[in-house]
Interface confidence: low
């Protein structure tokens, strides 16, 4: 399910330039070894481990750069509004593409907390080179964060890092039809860590959704609901404090 | 500056129970699990569990499960460790350790606690 | 669980020496290895966090490499106030293991 991409390969300018075909706008290197640009701790937050995981626990306000922290990331209070009617996206003095979607944005939720769990509503549904971030952090002692990209009552992708099933830090990825679990694809690379800031980016692509944390690819997930269109919504639910979720168009 | 300091020793008679205290101070207590760490006379050391200070929940190893329990007094910054039906090979010192930044870590330790069981 | 196996089980050195101690892992713990220091009577202290990152106040004379299986610490230059028994421990998954001890001695 992971393959061994690094954003740092794609945009390093060695060899080739952008490896597996990534967009030139998926991410940013983060400041310093595992840092976040605008935090004071490059890469350790103090914390407390959920249990199984990542012993360490943040004290509130512990990622001093949130909301702006995170290129890329809509600056605080950045909300273009609300779509104006079926399927459009309008930009607030900016030029929109051909289709549903503008080439930029971001559009959703405003920066700042949010309310844990969060829909974000995805009107026109997903489409290809659709680029959804989500920012927030990490809970003192975090069990489970879960992001739903939902058709209906269908769950076309399940995105379910879990702190602690039978000792060990693990993602389950899945897909529900008709009340059905599938098959789960499970990735043991674990990028979160209890009381930590996170960026999570999910890449839609025409066959798969690509997710990235942190600025480095983590994953990918085949499409098994294939009307992308039908996708409207993205629940963001879990032991995290939200600090926004927007999409645009890359 | 961060301590952890634990109560006193203890000599107790098989059978009885021990309650061993950890007063934290010098951070935010809730921000960092407590681990308790066994080690007998001479032995290495042994991780019992930990304690989710935030919530409270206590997680054991399996050696440690069913005579031993956490606990929070969280208004006064300690953890506790409870052994109940002391048996001679409970003797050891037990230390508090907290959890630091990073994974599995533990950055501060108690001065540990003996705990003598003798008949 | 995972079985941590430090060698050599004791050590003699003499002093300005640089010497190393090995921790091998059952499985592969990525790099969440922490070393510590305990010193005859004394508490547990923590020398190095995530294979190779120091500790606060611990001296640059200490040193952790590895990830995977395989890790070691080395001190250079021993000092005297270095003689201590050295564990490690993994942070990977529960539950969290130490290895046997390494005791240090000086020649």
């Known amino acids: 399910m992971a393959d061994n991409f690094s954003l740092h390969d794609a945009l390093s300018g060695s060899g080739n330039p952008n490896p597996q075909g990534w967009p030139g706008a998926w991410g940013n290197q983060p400041a310093g070894a595992g840092g976040y640009p605008g935090a004071s701790y490059p890469g350790a937050y103090p914390g407390q481990a959920p249990p199984g995981a990542y012993p360490g626990q943040a004290p509130p306000g512990a990622y001093p750069g949130a909301p702006g922290a995170y290129p890329g990331a809509p600056a605080p209070g950045v909300y273009p509004g609300p779509p104006s009617g079926p399927g459009a996206y309008p930009s607030s003095g900016q030029p929109s593409a051909t289709g549903a979607y503008p080439a930029t944005g971001p559009y959703g939720a405003p920066a700042g907390p949010l309310i844990v769990p969060y829909n974000l509503p995805l009107p026109g549904g997903v489409v290809p080179r659709m680029l959804i971030t989500i920012l927030g952090t990490v809970k003192p002692n975090a069990n489970r964060i879960a992001l739903d990209f939902q058709r209906g009552n269908d769950v076309a992708f399940h995105f379910n890092p879990r702190f602690n099933e039978n000792n060990r830090r693990v993602i389950v990825c899945n897909t529900k039809l008709d009340n059905n679990w599938g098959r789960e694809e499970r990735q043991s690379v674990f990028p979160f860590e209890s009381g930590k800031p996170f960026k999570i980016q999910v890449l839609v692509e025409p066959d798969h959704f690509k997710v990235a944390v942190n600025d480095a690819h983590l994953l990918q997930y085949n499409h098994r609901v294939k009307k992308l269109n039908e996708i409207s919504k993205l629940g963001i639910s879990g032991d995290i404090d939200l600090t926004s979720a927007s999409y645009t168009m890359i | 500056q961060i301590q952890l300091v634990q109560s006193g020793p203890e000599v107790k008679k098989p059978g009885e129970t021990v309650k061993i205290s950890c007063k934290a101070s010098?951070?935010?207590?809730?921000?960092?699990?407590m681990n308790w760490v066994k080690q007998a006379p001479g032995k290495g050391l042994k991780w019992m569990g930990w304690?989710?200070?935030?919530?409270?929940?206590?997680t054991y190893t399996d050696d440690f499960k069913g005579r031993f329990a956490f606990s929070l007094e969280t208004s006064a910054s300690t953890a506790y460790l409870q052994i109940n039906n002391l048996k001679n090979e409970d003797t050891a010192t037990y230390f508090c350790?907290?959890?630091?930044?990073?994974?599995?870590?533990?950055?501060?330790w108690g001065q540990g606690t003996s705990v003598t069981v003798s008949s | 669980d995972i079985r941590m196996t430090q060698s050599p089980s004791s050590l003699s050195a003499s002093l300005g020496d640089t010497i190393t101690i090995t921790c091998h892992a059952s499985?592969?713990?990525?790099?969440?290895l922490s070393w510590y220091q305990q010193k005859p009577g004394n508490i547990p202290k923590l020398l190095i966090y995530?294979?190779?990152n120091l500790h606060t106040g611990v001296p640059s004379r200490f040193s952790g490499s590895g990830s995977g299986t395989g890790f070691t610490l080395t001190i250079s230059s021993l000092q005297p106030e270095d003689i201590a028994t050295y564990y490690c421990?993994?942070?990977?998954?529960?539950?969290?293991?130490f290895g046997g001890g390494t005791k240090l001695e000086l020649k």
């Open positions: 304690i989710n200070t935030y919530t409270g929940e206590p």
């Open positions: 995530k294979a190779s």
């Open positions: 010098g951070y935010i207590f809730t921000n960092y699990g």
């Open positions: 350790a907290k959890f630091g930044n990073y994974v599995g870590a533990m950055d501060y």
């Open positions: 499985q592969n713990i990525n790099v969440w």
């Open positions: 421990q993994q942070g990977q998954s529960y539950p969290y293991t």
